[in-house]
Amino acid sequence: GELETSDVVTVVLGQDAKLPCFYRGDSGEQVGQVAWARVDAGEGAQELALLHSKYGLHVSPAYEGRVEQPPPPRNPLDGSVLLRNAVQADEGEYECRVSTFPAGSFQARLRLRVLVPPLPSLNPGPALEEGQGLTLAASCTAEGSPAPSVTWDTEVKGTTSSRSFKHSRSAAVTSEFHLVPSRSMNGQPLTCVVSHPGLLQDQRITHILHVSFLAEASVRGLEDQNLWHIGREGAMLKCLSEGQPPPSYNWTRLDGPLPSGVRVDGDTLGFPPLTTEHSGIYVCHVSNEFSSRDSQVTVDVLDPQEDSGKQVDLVSAS
């Protein structure tokens, strides 16, 4: 007769491992007992379990509650056992020793491989600001056994670098994604992709990029200066900018306080019916946590009785 087993049994952490050991004997041969032991190099054999044709299953105290025979129906020549809830420490070499009658003893070894699927974590880098050089956008770390693969999936242009740390029974892989921040990257997804034989499908963690910036400010509303005449209603100035985080707006008048009746509504400055006292230099101040910008305009309210048109100056300042 001969023993049938596997060279390697692979299970995922927490799953049950079937350790196969089947005696393919000649007719009339019987299996008296099957002794299972862990036989890692440099250590003596450590009892796992003993399957006896008469006494039944004996489980070593170290494996109490974790070793079972496969469910019925059972073949008396089958010495396989189930190791419940495999842990990383179970990884190693196992031996089944089969005592048969009348053929004698046979033994076979197998290796149990316990896959430890990674639990990846993504850590964003420091705050991204437009104008910075090459900056860490995010790092992704995954530890498992064997070492997982960590890659990036994104439309954003950048560079990656990886490093690996080996532990006694696992390996941790960290991959970093560096980029030169620009406002076009804002809101773009950066996805860490972790592959591992213990995973049914790749694990993905997505980080949305936030790049701080503040665009130049400009003021709209003075495009047709002839509209700014005494008595006109609904005149308004609108401050234009954009940024991340979204900016706040503040209006001031350079040559004095804002005239009474002038309404500030965020980025918009609303005027009551125009009078000559509304003439002046108005400043829009745009700011966010990243930066601040100013834009100033000169309003000259025309008196229709005067024939000559007035020049309107638009000055933008940062």
Partner: antibody, heavy 123, light 107 residues
Framework: EVQLVESGGGLVQPGGSLRLSCAAS????????MSWVRQAPGKGLEWVSG????????YYADSVKGRFTISRDNSKNTLYLQMNSLRAEDTAVYYC????????????????WGQGTLVTVSS | DIQMTQSPSSLSASVGDRVTITCRAS??????LAWYQQKPGKAPKLLIY???SLQSGVPSRFSGSGSGTDFTLTISSLQPEDFATYYC?????????FGQGTKVEIK
């Protein structure tokens, strides 16, 4: 025919020592694990000590640990129990018995027993 | 240690009676259970091993059953020579432990 014959029992004072022997015959002595089991007068059976066929491993009941020593001489087919610091509660008939080692620390039932030797600890 | 609880501690029966003795282990011991018979002044004698296997030379009126934690010794038809004390013993772990015994007396 398998035979186990104990000897060495007797009367001893508390704190004294005694050495029991068990002579085996009729089977291959060094293929079997051996043990000592005792029975106090009018009481049940209590396992005392055991030894593997090659003497590599010995086992003791908590009640005798540190006081009793089991040993064997496979060349003489003999099992021993050295009993020191004897107490009144050690008074019992001492039996030797054989069992087959299946694997690791797993044994069959004891299929043959000696007739026993009486140990009396009294002042 | 594994505790073995035997019941009853004694029983009275007549020749020809069917006698049942039970033994319970404090934890699972598969079939690592033996039954012994002991007569006054004599050594214990193995009757049943592996919970249900009859030792060679033991009359077939003796039988054993059970596995795990609950076991039974049955004497199908009590004979005069069967009046004795019966012990169960587990040898699943060290130390092996015995039940307290069941004394079978003549009614």
């Amino acid at each position: 025919e398998v035979q186990l014959v104990e000897s060495g029992g007797g009367l001893v004072q508390p704190g004294g020592s005694l050495r029991l022997s068990c002579a085996a015959s009729g089977y291959n002595f060094d293929n079997y694990a051996m043990s000592w089991v005792r029975q106090a007068p009018g009481k049940g059976l209590e396992w005392v000590s055991g030894i593997k066929p090659d003497s590599a491993t010995t086992y003791y009941a908590d009640s005798v640990k540190g006081r009793f020593t089991i040993s064997r001489d496979n060349s003489k087919n003999t099992l021993y129990l050295q009993m020191n610091s004897l107490r009144a509660e050690d008074t019992a008939v001492y039996y030797c018995a054989r069992a087959e080692l299946l694997a690791f620390d797993v044994y069959t039932a004891s299929d043959y027993w000696g007739q026993g030797t009486l140990v009396t600890v009294s002042s | 240690d594994i505790q073995m609880t035997q019941s009853p501690s004694s029983l009275s029966a007549s020749v020809g009676d069917r006698v049942t003795i039970t033994c319970r282990a404090s934890q699972g011991i598969s079939s690592y259970l033996a039954w012994y018979q002991q007569k006054p002044g004599k050594a214990p004698k193995l009757l049943i091993y592996a919970a249900s296997s009859l030792q060679s030379g033991v009359p077939s009126r003796f039988s054993g059953s059970g596995s795990g934690t609950d076991f039974t010794l049955t004497i199908s038809s009590l004979q005069p020579e069967d009046f004795a004390t019966y012990y169960c013993q587990q040898h699943y772990t060290t130390p092996p432990t015995f039940g307290q015994g069941t004394k079978v007396e003549i009614k």
